[in-house]
Interface confidence: low
């Protein structure tokens, strides 16, 4: 009679995480008598997966009834597959011996590959806000997927970005993988309402990629522009001067009026108006009693926005000739150093 062969007909099996894997194995003969065992891996470090003779293997069920005398089907099912189950499984026939059974013949092995979905991408932006024309970095991370092949794309408001670097770890074989990508995004004035999207496509997602988003409203700071104007005289000896604070984001803003360098009033932006692009406008006014001043008055509107160095704009109020019409603005004065050297 022909010598027993152990046949594993499937070279490889691909299973999605959470599902059940069927590993097929048949013997060509009932002789010699002895049990079947399943192992993951080969050599001395192999891991016992199922032993027909003894042991408790809660995730493993047999396809056939192995207690029947004429059974030659030793296929098994492994439930609730995870990426950690990936590997090559061997069906091994043992010959009955004393005191121990002796390994007789092994099948060629079946490689179990596990398809595991990537986790939802998490996008994180810079710790500090930046102003338009700066480039900021965003990172995107997703974990636990298998196989290794994966595609990651970045978008800003639906437009694909090209300036990014992506790594998939580990480089070698692993039960599951992680992806990490860093994209550079240039901020523009209109980005308060913008979104950065990281899109991950993987075989397990069946064409429906996962997306992670970050709102640039959490990243951008749009500094205000200031305009100081003198309104027509409201009453004898009283002049109304307004400071228009335009196009700023976020809302956190404190304004200080100075008369000839002395603090007159400080207030915090409250009733702001929102522009279409998401930035804010605000207006503050100061009623100046001209008769209280013998000389010309320098009025300064000083704004501290989002904890940044104050910017200011001044207006010269002529006391000698009581102004009846709008005065002119002087150039903006930046109280903080505006020059940036990088060496």
């Amino acid at each position: 009679e022909e010598e027993l062969q152990v046949i594993q007909p499937d070279k490889s099996v691909l299973v999605a995480a959470g599902e059940t894997a069927t590993l097929r194995c048949t013997a060509t003969s009932l002789i010699p008598v002895g049990p079947i065992q399943w192992f993951r891996g080969a050599g001395p470090g192999r891991e016992l997966i199922y032993n027909q003779k003894e042991g408790h293997f809660p995730r493993v069920t047999t396809v056939s009834d192995l207690t029947k005398r004429n059974n030659m089907d030793f296929s098994i099912r492994i439930g609730n597959i995870t990426p950690a189950d990936a590997g090559t499984y061997y069906c091994v026939k043992f010959r009955k011996g004393s005191p121990d059974d002796v390994e007789f013949k092994s099948g060629a092995g079946t490689e179990l590959s596990v398809r595991a979905k990537p986790s939802a991408p998490v996008v994180s932006g810079p710790a500090a806000r930046a102003t338009p024309q700066h480039t900021v970095s965003f990172t995107c991370e997703s974990h636990g997927f298998s196989p290794r092949d994966i595609t990651l794309k970045w978008f800003k408001n639906g437009n694909e970005l090209s300036d990014f670097q992506t790594n998939v770890d580990p480089v070698g074989e692993s039960v599951s993988y992680s992806i990490h990508s860093t994209a550079k995004v240039v901020l523009t004035r209109e980005d308060v309402h913008s979104q950065v999207i990281c899109e991950v496509a993987h075989v397990t997602l069946q064409g429906d990629p996962l997306r992670g988003t970050a709102n640039l409203s959490e990243t951008i700071r749009v500094p205000p522009t200031l305009e100081v104007t003198q309104q027509p005289v409201r009453a004898e000896n009283q002049v109304n001067v307004t400071c228009q604070v335009r196009k700023f984001y976020p809302q956190r803003l404190q304004l200080t009026w100075l008369e000839n360098g002395n603090v007159s009033r400080t207030e915090t932006a409250s009733t702001v108006t929102e522009n279409k692009d998401g930035t804010y406008n605000w207006m503050s006014w100061l009623l100046v009693n001209v008769s209280a001043h013998r000389d010309d008055v320098k009025l300064t509107c000083q704004v501290e926005h989002d904890g940044q160095p104050a910017v200011s704009k001044s207006h010269d109020l002529k006391v000698s000739a009581h102004p009846k019409e709008q005065g002119s603005n002087t150039a903006a004065e930046n109280t903080g150093s505006n020059e940036r050297n990088i060496y």
């Epitope: 930046a130 338009p132 090209s162 550079k184 060496y343």
Partner: antibody, heavy 123, light 107 residues
């Protein structure tokens, strides 16, 4: 059509100053940072620095601090390069070049260039 | 400062030739590398950014490759208008630096 239009050639004496202009056409000046690049006769290109056209914040390369000033007049969509106390070695073609922004750590590639302004310093 | 070195410094070729210009950075610049073309008396023209991306309007015969320290500009089939000087520029680290250029001449 996007263009950077620079002012014409200048002949100056040592010690004088010069102001080169670069007008942005076909786009909003304040949406893109502006670089300045020098090319001495028969030489390569040398990056001088850039100005953040939104905030007006200039950044100067090491050899261009002090006598060189970058400025803007957004009302006429123009960036300026002013050089003071001119020396013979300042003789060069000066280019403005636009970049889509600048990187805090990575600089930027230039997509549009001005036609160049030749500044000659000679006694 | 990062030094950029291009080779060769000059190159003679004929119309229709395939030409390769290499650029080496003294340290890793990732893919933050650009290529420019300059003709005598003219401003530079931007060809390639991020090592491999062509600007709109740049003919497909121009292609860039490389990352880290070694980069290549390839012109697949030289046209008469391609004879010029080619510069590479790194924009990974301040100060932004250019190489001295490769002059491409008619053989």
């Amino acid at each position: 059509q996007i263009q950077l239009v620079q002012s014409g050639s200048e002949l100056k004496k040592p010690g004088a100053s010069v102001k080169v202009s670069c007008r942005a056409r076909g786009y909003t000046l304040t949406d893109y940072a502006m670089n300045w690049v020098r090319q001495a006769p028969g030489q390569g290109l040398e990056w001088m620095g850039f100005i953040n056209t939104y905030t007006g914040e200039p950044t100067y390369a090491q050899g261009f601090k002090g006598r060189f000033v970058f400025s803007l007049d957004t009302s006429v969509s123009t960036a300026y390069l002013q050089i003071g106390s001119l020396k013979a070695e300042d003789t060069a073609v000066y280019y403005c070049a636009r970049t889509r922004g600048y990187y805090d750590f990575d600089g930027g590639a230039f997509d549009y260039w001005g036609q160049g302004t030749l500044v000659t310093v000679s006694s | 400062d990062i030094q950029m070195t291009q080779s060769p410094s000059s190159l003679s070729a004929s119309v229709g030739d395939r030409v390769t210009i290499t650029c080496r950075a003294s340290q890793n610049v990732g893919t933050h590398l650009a290529w420019y073309q300059q003709k005598p008396g003219k401003a530079p023209k931007s060809l390639i950014y991020s090592a491999i991306y062509r600007y709109i309007g740049v003919p497909s015969r121009f292609s860039g490759s490389g990352s880290g320290t070694d980069f290549t500009l390839t012109i697949s089939s030289l046209q008469p208008e391609d004879f010029a000087t080619y510069f590479c520029q790194q924009y990974n680290t301040y100060p932004l630096t250019f190489d001295q250029g490769t002059k491409l001449e008619i053989k």
